[in-house]
Amino acid sequence: DAHKSEVAHRFKDLGEENFKALVLIAFAQYLQQCPFEDHVKLVNEVTEFAKTCVADESAENCDKSLHTLFGDKLCTVATLRETYGEMADCCAKQEPERNECFLQHKDDNPNLPRLVRPEVDVMCTAFHDNEETFLKKYLYEIARRHPYFYAPELLFFAKRYKAAFTECCQAADKAACLLPKLDELRDEGKASSAKQRLKCASLQKFGERAFKAWAVARLSQRFPKAEFAEVSKLVTDLTKVHTECCHGDLLECADDRADLAKYICENQDSISSKLKECCEKPLLEKSHCIAEVENDEMPADLPSLAADFVESKDVCKNYAEAKDVFLGMFLYEYARRHPDYSVVLLLRLAKTYETTLEKCCAAADPHECYAKVFDEFKPLVEEPQNLIKQNCELFEQLGEYKFQNALLVRYTKKVPQVSTPTLVEVSRNLGKVGSKCCKHPEAKRMPCAEDYLSVVLNQLCVLHEKTPVSDRVTKCCTESLVNRRPCFSALEVDETYVPKEFNAETFTFHADICTLSEKERQIKKQTALVELVKHKPKATKEQLKAVMDDFAAFVEKCCKADDKETCFAEEGKKLVAASQAALGL
């Protein structure tokens, strides 16, 4: 349905508040270094223009595309070349190349200061003084640090952020009320950002077909009672929503997401019995709830898959007639029967099935060739099962911190060229799989663990893509989306790596470590551990454990000393010498 003015159409659909918030998110995700005030000014100008178009859709420039309008606005920023360098060259291009150019310059790791949380009273005063600015600033700070954050979901986070301040700033103990809520929003926000980043990487690096396959598998697990045609419709609509958001078309994305939620709720009888509560909520909560809804129960008495996909004489005929539809049906049927499998495992099985059909349907007797295709699935299923079992046992034995350390050592030995901050961040997140998933029963462990690992390894891939340093990382990241985790798991110690020169400065610590939070202190120690492995990649677990134990004792001792700084200086030298001796550096 063509509209005379796209900007007027979206303004009317979304309402002024959401329109302004989404334009702010879009601008902050594109121009990540621009000051808050500059973005607010641009957003206000766009909003005023949109209002003129609502009043008269035939008014000058109202017929222009959103990319043209927004791009023109971004290109008015005076300091574009000084602040962004070659991104300024995007402004010389015409749409759609200009928008593609902006997208390519999104930075997953922008050089921005860490967000420091002010005192609760300071935050509450700011909230009461100007609620609107306070909430806009939240959107801006999150969007510029997470340029692929799912925009309609960020509106939901902002709503919860506002609710937290509204409630807690009038509580007797403001801090006790507010801080846990802010911690929860921060942790959920990071997880949401990382999950969306994988969706965008899937679409941008592996194409629409890869994303649709992922969506078929996930929605079939979630809605096993829905017909294939229904799941296919949902997949098509969901793909459009995420394509738009990943492409910077945030107004269209939010609008289409709302339409999809409306459709799902109007048709919940043919989709899932678990949607009732979600569908009673307001729009933002409803969309979030649907996205997180638990899997519906599997229909009773589902027939064996073999009948249609192995035993039937029509397998190759059906495959030839519509390859992707037939493979989609296979994936749907397999996934709805296996909520206990990870999505990536289901996609590996579908890929194996496709490869087998490609080979066997070319034969004179295809059935003879593909009759045992399901036997090929067994090792593919057992590999993640065994890996999760082993790692959950290790996690239960070590606890989260030491489990993270084991992974830090493991991954530093696999890809020692990767920067230390990236190795620490990624390994810490990999280690969180233990507390997140190992508590689950067997039937829920694999979908929890392996799909979470896919999200974390994608963080490694996008960070590494910015400054590639390891061919092995590039290979695992680019060859196959669904085989990334097995590819990294299969990497052994990099024998070609030349150990890093020893630098005493890396292992020099000061009294400021004593005032850090437990988490920050862990990161300092884990950073030292990565550096140790980079200096001595052949060090044994026992050697590394001994050095780390000495290091922990050293920090504890000096933090208790009267003259902390002197202790760190003197004892630090002794520790470095002892560590060098222990590791033969």
Partner: nanobody, 115 residues
Amino acid sequence: EVQLLESGGGLVQPGGSLRLSCAASGFSFGSFGMSWVRQAPGKGPEWVSAIDSGGADTRYAETVKGRFTISRDNSKNTLYLQMNSLRPEDTAVYYCTIGRSTSRSSQGTLVTVSS
């Protein structure tokens, strides 16, 4: 959309010969093994012969072995069945299929062997 169009059938005397053709479109013909299937009046479908995608491997039902020859020309997207020493019991509608399917998705071509 997959389309298979058979031709070359007709009335022939016992001992005679016919060459059937099947023109294929709507799928990657050169990637799939193909078969000929026949259905005599009042009977179920019977698989006759199969060929792999490259034309190197051919298979035949015992009833036609030594008399029929299956072949293909991938450049023309066409499947052939050369039928020699025809017998009255070969009378049937012949149709080509993808793989070893016996489902009929085309009209077929009628072969009648009678004196």
